[in-house]
């Protein structure tokens, strides 16, 4: 046997190079037929009506043909015929590599609330071979469930993933991408998640920055509160009390001026949104005022110094405590 | 100059065989198909067959059972035997170079089947 | 399925066009070859392939193709071109040659 041939790999659309070699060439007819065993070339003429079929290159060694614009229809066995004694026949397989047609996401719903369990399918339309359909949710890569249906030698892949979202995928891309031999780089969609949460409470003391809180003094608390959708109601109370009369209520702050021990106790912030309620509580302890002493002798005291000096003249048992902050959710 | 040149018996009786040979003159006698082709008086042509150098055939379904195509490589001749001739095998007989179509031509013979 | 089917005459004025036909179903995938044949005289290729031309052969021959049928149209025909001209082609396998029955033109004037 000294025809040789070998076979081809193409993607749809792109051009197949066929090349019949031969060698010790006695100069003998040489054809190529299509698999329908139809001639395209004899020798150097092409009695097919195929145009898509050019010759590249005819000598009494090869036969080398391009075929434009490869179709699904093309593949097969293209064989080429050497007229020696014996006749010798190879023949060379033609792959025809069809990339996606389309690369769909479906999310089951828009908004998904925090907890649920969501369903994200990808639909990997008409390849050859099927495709490889890979999941991530950010740079995390997830596992999903393909099905591959089959069409006229074309392949249809959908991968369902079960995702359960967490306020922290809210804005987060979920991302189907393919893998396939004719698709070069990163063919990929991606839709990104929308997660309702509940609020989550933070109470901020704005006023007195350091912190303590004595008897005569203001105390200014700001609540925070952050969930999707933005909570509408943010609600001051106090827990198992009214309310001080002296206490003013402004949108998200709370002002209580001339702080006295009657004023101890817990003020809670709550704030709700469709998906939930939620609450953060403040703990409030009224210090005694601070006694009078005359400034200090030395010059050049530090912030350090003087902090201690403070701390050394309360006499309260719980002298240096804070007011303290507790974030519960409901 | 390239060309084919043929000769053979030109009067037969039925029942023999008609024996033809063709000669071509030129380079690549294994790069092509010859052919043998026939037509009657007054009616259309009629291919007959084809050999190649190696001696790959193909003939004519309605003449298959009594014609023979050989040849001889060493002289760049190609041959066509016809047995059991009648008076409707009478023709001008071709041989010609194919390379698919026949893109050169012997002068022919005329054949007559007569008793 | 293997025959090739020509109108048997066609006549032309002189230095008019005429266009010869041949119909049959390997001229969906083949193309035909056409041949002009005078008296007494072996065929001549005039056509062969899409639309090619031996040499010697003069620019008014020309070919086409459309489904199963394939044209042979001579623009501006001359005397000389009176004549008989056939197609040919291959049968569906290509292993086996097939002529139309042929088409005898005349060139009037």
């Known amino acids: 046997q000294n025809l040789f041939t070998k076979d081809v790999t193409v993607i749809e659309g792109e051009v197949a190079t066929i090349s019949c070699q031969v060698n010790k060439s006695d100069d003998s007819v040489i054809q190529l037929l299509n698999p329908n065993r139809q001639t395209i070339y004899f020798r150097d003429f092409r009695p097919l009506k195929d145009s898509r079929f050019q010759l590249l290159n005819f000598s009494s060694s090869e036969l080398k043909v391009s075929l434009t614009n490869v179709s699904i229809s093309d593949e097969g066995r293209y064989f080429c015929q050497l007229y020696t004694d014996p006749p010798q026949e190879s023949y060379t397989t033609i792959t025809v590599l069809v990339p996606p047609r389309n690369l769909m996401i479906d999310i089951q719903r828009d908004t998904a609330v925090e907890g649920e369990e969501i369903e994200v399918n990808c639909t990997a339309m008409a390849s050859k071979p099927a495709t490889t359909i890979r999941w991530f949710k950010g740079n995390t890569e997830l596992k999903g469930k393909s099905e591959v249906e089959e069409w006229s030698d074309m392949y249809t892949v959908t991968s369902q993933l079960m995702l359960k979202v967490h306020k922290e995928d809210d804005g987060v891309p979920v991302i189907c991408q393919v893998e396939h031999p004719a698709v070069t780089g990163n063919l990929q969609t991606q839709r990104y998640l929308e997660v309702q949460y509940k609020p989550q409470v933070h109470i901020q003391m704005t006023y007195p920055l350091q912190g303590l809180t004595r008897e005569g003094d203001a105390l200014e608390l700001t609540c925070e509160a952050i969930g999707k959708p933005q909570p509408v109601m943010v609600t001051w109370v106090r827990v198992d009390d009214e309310m001080p009369q002296h206490a003013v209520l402004s949108g998200p702050n709370l002002f209580i001026n001339n702080l006295n021990k009657t004023d101890n106790g817990t003020y809670r912030c709550e704030a709700s949104n469709i998906v939930g309620k939620a609450h953060s509580d403040y703990m409030l302890y009224v210090y005694d005022p601070p006694t009078t002493i005359p400034p200090p002798t030395t010059t050049t005291t530090t912030t350090t110094t003087t902090t201690t000096t403070i701390l050394t003249i309360i006499t309260d048992s719980r002298a240096g405590e804070e007011g303290s902050i507790r974030a519960v959710d409901h | 100059q390239v060309q084919l040149q043929q000769w053979g018996a030109g009067l037969l009786k039925p029942s023999e065989t008609l024996s033809l040979t063709c000669a071509f003159y030129?380079?690549?006698?294994?790069?092509?198909?010859w052919s043998w082709i026939r037509q009657p008086p007054g009616k259309g042509l009629e291919w007959i067959g084809e050999?190649?150098?190696?001696?790959?055939?193909n003939y004519n379904p309605s003449l298959k059972s009594r014609v023979t195509i050989s040849v001889d490589t060493s002289k760049n001749q190609f041959s066509l035997k016809l047995n059991s001739v009648t008076a409707a095998d009478t023709a001008v007989y071709y041989c010609?170079?194919?390379?698919?179509?026949?893109?050169?031509w012997g002068r022919g013979t005329l054949v007559t089947v007569s008793s | 399925s293997s025959e090739l089917t020509q109108d048997p005459a066609v006549s032309v004025a002189l230095g008019q066009t005429v266009r010869i036909t041949c119909q049959g179903d390997?001229?969906?995938?083949?193309?035909a070859s056409w041949y002009q044949q005078k008296p007494g005289q072996a065929p001549v290729l005039v056509i062969y392939?899409?639309?090619n031309r031996p040499s010697g052969i003069p620019d008014r021959f020309s070919g086409s193709s459309s489904g199963n049928t394939a044209s042979l149209t001579i623009t501006g025909a001359q005397a000389e071109d009176e004549a008989d001209y056939y197609c040919?082609?291959?049968?569906?396998?290509?292993?086996?040659?097939?002529f139309g029955g042929g088409t005898m033109l005349t060139v009037l004037g």
């Open positions: 050999i190649n150098h190696s001696g790959s055939t």
């Open positions: 390997s001229l969906r995938s083949y193309y």
């Open positions: 392939g899409k639309n």
């Open positions: 040919n082609s291959r049968d569906s396998s290509g292993n086996h040659v097939v």
């Open positions: 010609a170079r194919s390379s698919w179509y026949f893109d050169l």
């Open positions: 030129g380079e690549s006698f294994s790069g092509y198909y």
